[in-house]
């Protein structure tokens, strides 16, 4: 190796200056005794190198790039060798931004997978490798005092969510949770959430069904639908409220919302609908009166309202 580049910092804020030095060893005897060191950033030659001979016979060129505006580039020092440039050394330069504070951190407790799933928005592009870590601890109070730390949760590359498994959770007890973002230019932390995993529980929706007509029950009136629902059994012991939405299958009508319905209603007669019309219906539920998240909407149920009862018209016959 005849040459070696050293830089003030290989990673800088985008637009910041960077200083580099290229030293050519004296024992590179095949070189011109007074070689002219050239600088190249990417494919472009860079003027402004200040060259000097040091006391030990080595040649040094120093260059200051006033603004590094490339997020990634190779800086090389070279010599003219015949009709071509002989690259002596090159370094990769990176430029970008420190991580912004991750925001909109929110979590959901999934009782089926037994995990607390947290997601966040990472903020603007940093142009640098940036790692995110979901950090948490157990707390007996309102997260002012920190209890046992919980193992860091590291998302897969490029993902802005992470799952804390059940073995690291304590239900009905608060946890402090935050996201830490880190890259070569700095570290930032989101505001801390303080939550009991059960207070962010997201239930599965009930299953909507047509109510089986019983012999003793009156058939639905015109413009009415009789339906029932089967609660999601793993959430059966959680008090919930539910809401129903419906819209005609044809046309561009928007959803109409009906609720709140207690989960325990289990069956319902929906009236005030158009007669002889096919409707799409869905239901969703939320833990209530305790905090929770709405379930997704259930799979659709498609039902048709009955015809309006026939009216009697008197026809006058002309002879």
């Amino acid at each position: 190796e005849c040459g070696h580049i050293s830089v003030s910092a290989p990673i800088v804020h985008l637009g910041d200056p960077i200083t580099a030095s290229c030293i050519i060893k004296q024992n590179c005897s095949h070189l011109d005794p007074e070689p002219q060191i050239l600088w190249r950033l990417g494919a472009e030659l860079q003027p402004g190198g200040r060259q000097q001979r040091l006391s030990d016979g080595t040649q040094e060129s120093i260059i200051t790039l006033p603004h590094l505006n490339h997020t990634q580039a190779f800086l090389s020092c070279a010599l003219n060798w015949g009709n071509s440039l002989q690259i002596l050394d090159q370094v990769e330069l990176r430029a970008g931004y420190p991580p912004a504070i991750p925001h909109n951190l929110s979590c959901l407790m999934n009782l089926t997978t037994s995990s607390l799933i947290c997601q966040w928005e990472p903020g603007p592009e940093t142009h640098l490798p940036t790692s995110f870590t979901l950090k948490s601890f157990k707390s007996r109070g309102n997260c002012q005092t920190q209890g046992d730390s919980i193992l860091d949760c590291v998302p897969k590359d490029g993902q802005s969510h992470c799952s804390i498994p059940r073995k690291h959770l304590l239900l009905y007890q608060n946890m402090g949770i935050w996201v830490q973002a880190e890259n070569a230019l700095g570290t930032s932390m989101s505001p801390q959430l303080c939550l009991d995993p059960m207070d962010v529980v997201k239930l599965e929706p009930p299953m909507l069904r047509t109510m089986d007509p019983s012999p003793e029950a009156a058939p639905p009136q015109a413009g009415c639908l009789q339906l029932s629902w089967e609660p999601w059994q793993p959430g059966l012991h959680i008090n919930q409220k539910c809401e129903l939405r419906h819209k005609p299958q044809r046309g561009e009508a928007s959803w109409a919302l009906v609720g709140p319905l207690p989960l325990e209603a289990l069956q319902y007669e929906l009236c005030g609908l158009l007669p002889a019309t096919a409707y799409t219906l869905q239901i969703r539920c939320i833990r209530w009166p305790l905090p929770g998240h709405w379930s997704d909407w259930s799979p659709s149920l498609e039902l048709r309202t009955t015809e309006r009862a026939p009216t009697h018209h008197h026809h006058h016959h002309h002879h």
Epitope: L111, T112, T113, S114, R166, K167, L171, M198, P231, Q233, P234, L236, H237, I238, N239, P262, E264, A265, L266, P289
Partner: antibody
Framework: EVQLLESGGGLVQPGGSLRLSCAAS????????MGWVRQAPGKGLEWVSS????????PYADSVKGRFTISRDNSKNTLYLQMNSLRAEDTAVYYC???????????WGQGTLVTVSS | DIQMTQSPSSLSASVGDRVTITCRAS??????LNWYQQKPGKAPKLLIY???NLQNGVPSRFSGSGSGTDFTLTISSLQPEDFATYYC?????????FGGGTKVEIK
């Protein structure tokens, strides 16, 4: 502190009826599912029935379906189990219990003995 | 219906021993598994709920693990007051079922 106090147990002939009561205190009764669990002499625990917080959902074990009825009076903080057509195999200590959101029996009464024998 | 199989049905151990009781569900129940302790003539007492959550007031020598179909209750260092019968219970689906019990006796 959660307190559950069962009453109404006793000796009854096969085919007879009994009504068990459970008086609850120390928690907001109307917010919790409640249930009955029984234990035959020298045997393990057997779920009998549960009732939702406002009484609308009442599942039963197959062994008692059609014979037992669970109910509650939230204004009186009381849980009931009406037992009809009693059989010898219904002989057990009957426990009243408070259920948690994940189906765990968080609090138990001291139990009341029901003996079905001629 | 989901059947619960507990093993062993009884065991003898000494004070200070580490004791492990297992419970197997006939089909997957996620983490909906609870553990109870019962002493003769007394009502059962909840120890662990949702597979691994320690009920308030229960000593930390009790711990639960497992998910799906296989679950374990561990007593890290058996104390004289721990000699009792232990039951598991699934609470994911109706009807609710308890395991047959494990009696922990003094060796």
């Amino acid at each position: 502190e959660v307190q559950l106090l069962e009453s109404g147990g006793g000796l009854v002939q096969p085919g007879g009826s009994l009504r068990l009561s459970c008086a609850a205190s120390g928690f907001t009764f109307s917010l919790y599912w409640m249930g009955w669990v029984r234990q035959a002499p020298g045997k393990g625990l057997e779920w009998v029935s549960s009732i939702s917080s406002s009484g609308g959902v009442t599942p039963y074990a197959d062994s008692v379906k059609g014979r037992f009825t669970i109910s509650r009076d939230n204004s009186k903080n009381t849980l009931y189990l009406q037992m009809n057509s009693l059989r010898a195999e219904d002989t057990a200590v009957y426990y009243c219990a408070k259920l948690g959101e994940l189906g765990q029996y968080m609090g138990w009464g001291q139990g009341t003995l029901v003996t079905v024998s001629s | 219906d989901i059947q619960m199989t507990q093993s062993p049905s009884s065991l003898s151990a000494s004070v200070g021993d580490r004791v492990t009781i297992t419970c197997r569900a006939s089909q997957g129940i996620s983490s909906y598994l609870n553990w109870y302790q019962q002493k003769p003539g007394k009502a059962p007492k909840l120890l662990i709920y949702y597979a691994s959550n320690l009920q308030n007031g229960v000593p930390s020598r009790f711990s639960g693990s497992g998910s799906g179909t296989d679950f374990t209750l561990t007593i890290s260092s058996l104390q004289p007051e721990d000699f009792a019968t232990y039951y598991c219970q699934q609470s994911m689906w109706m009807p609710i079922f308890f395991g047959g019990g494990t009696k922990v006796e003094i060796k």
